[in-house]
């Protein structure tokens, strides 16, 4: 006899990184026939939705019109069919960005390097933070943590053409409150094309992550996105 229903999926639209005072929608997808969904935030009940008619709806949306640091944190959802509750969803880490200041991102020896050269990014923020995050745009995105009083080093080691791309960094005041993003730094790597097929792939974010985030930042527009795996958020745990 089944004691619980399968866990629902949870995600944020347009993005789990939400600029301060912008809007975000938290989506929870369970099963057709669910009579109630509950959204929990940091262990406490945050919101409830009772879809009508339940047999025709398998997803609910909770709108947050005005993101702030009080709402940044870990969310999960559950749903109920009759008297039977589901397992809780995976955790969704909702991050508020554009807090306080803007870090400076630089790269050594420079933005144009040859394949095999050692490259280090430096993210600097003079306000009180000790954790920094380096993000690379695109499908093959890497998210790295770094630590330092005002500056963190991100050594990429000997680079390949797979490291080509646009990088930004954030200062992190806590796991769920980040600074403004730095200005982008574009890394150009010239080298042997044969090496690219052997380059390590790390699909941490979907291809349009930064496009979506920047859309949120600049216009606050809502945009429906396909469900995607939030393994990227493991960096927060």
């Amino acid at each position: 006899q089944q004691q619980t229903l399968p866990k629902p999926f949870i995600w944020a639209e347009p993005h789990f990184m939400v600029p301060k005072e912008k809007q975000v929608t938290i989506c929870c997808q369970g099963n057709y026939g669910a009579v109630e969904y509950q959204l929990h935030f940091e262990g406490s009940l945050f919101a409830v939705d009772r879809p009508k008619p339940p047999e025709r709806i398998n997803k609910v949306k909770f709108y947050i019109p005005d993101m702030n640091s009080r709402m940044a944190g870990q969310y999960s959802c559950i749903y109920r069919v009759g008297e039977l509750w589901s397992e809780p969803s995976n955790l969704l880490d909702l991050v508020v960005t554009e807090m306080y200041d803007t870090p400076t991102l630089s790269v050594h020896p420079g933005p144009e390097v040859i394949s095999g050269e050692k490259v280090t990014f430096y993210c600097r923020l003079d306000t009180a933070t000790s954790m920094f995050l380096l993000l690379k745009e695109g499908r093959s995105s890497h998210v790295q943590r770094g630590y330092g009083k005002v500056q963190a080093e991100f050594p990429l080691g000997p680079v390949t053409t797979a490291h080509r791309g646009t990088y930004r960094c954030f200062g992190s005041y806590n796991n769920h409150a980040w600074s403004f993003p730095s200005e982008p730094v574009k890394l150009l790597v010239t080298g042997d094309i044969e090496n690219t097929s052997l380059a390590p792939e790390d699909p941490t974010f979907p291809a349009d992550t930064w496009g979506t985030y920047l859309l949120t930042t600049e216009t606050g527009l809502q945009k429906d996105h396909a469900l995607w795996d939030h393994t990227a958020q493991n960096l927060l745990r």
């Epitope: 939705d49 009772r50 709108y63 019109p65 709402m71």
Partner: nanobody
Framework: EVQLVESGGGEVQPGGSLRLSCAAS????????MGWFRQAPGKEREFVAA???????YYAESVKGRFTISRDNAKNTVYLQMSSLRAEDTAVYYC????????????????????WGQGTLVTVKP
């Protein structure tokens, strides 16, 4: 900008009733989810009841069966009908709104609300 003004508070005996009103300014009331919270002296603000745009409701266990939340979109007003009042219901009662939101969402956590009233005092004593 939404402004919320509570009224209807006062002193009542245990077992008595009161009806609180919260009048909202602006044309956005129909797109708002509404809630009532309360704060007793020396305690944290706590959830009491909430109502969605589509009139779904949710109550704190401590008031279930005694309090009823309702809304009148034509009057831009949300109500809290309180009956069988107890001494532990003594508190300042605050009205709050989430604007805008989806139709059937009911918000329970105070962090979700982006507009708040100034509060009205309810005192229950013999």
């Amino acid at each position: 900008e939404v402004q919320l003004v509570e009224s209807g508070g006062g002193e009542v005996q245990p077992g008595g009733s009161l009806r609180l009103s919260c009048a909202a300014s602006g044309r956005t009331f129909a797109s708002a989810a509404m809630g009532w919270f309360r704060q007793a002296p020396g305690k944290e603000r706590e959830f009491v009841a909430a109502i969605s745009r589509s009139d779904d409701t949710y109550y704190a266990e401590s008031v279930k069966g005694r309090f009823t939340i309702s809304r009148d979109n034509a009057k831009n007003t949300v109500y809290l009908q309180m009956s069988s009042l107890r001494a532990e219901d003594t508190a300042v009662y605050y009205c709050a709104a989430v604007v805008p939101t989806y139709g059937s969402s009911i918000y329970v956590h105070s962090a979700a609300y982006n507009y708040w009233g100034q509060g009205t005092l309810v005192t229950v004593k013999p």
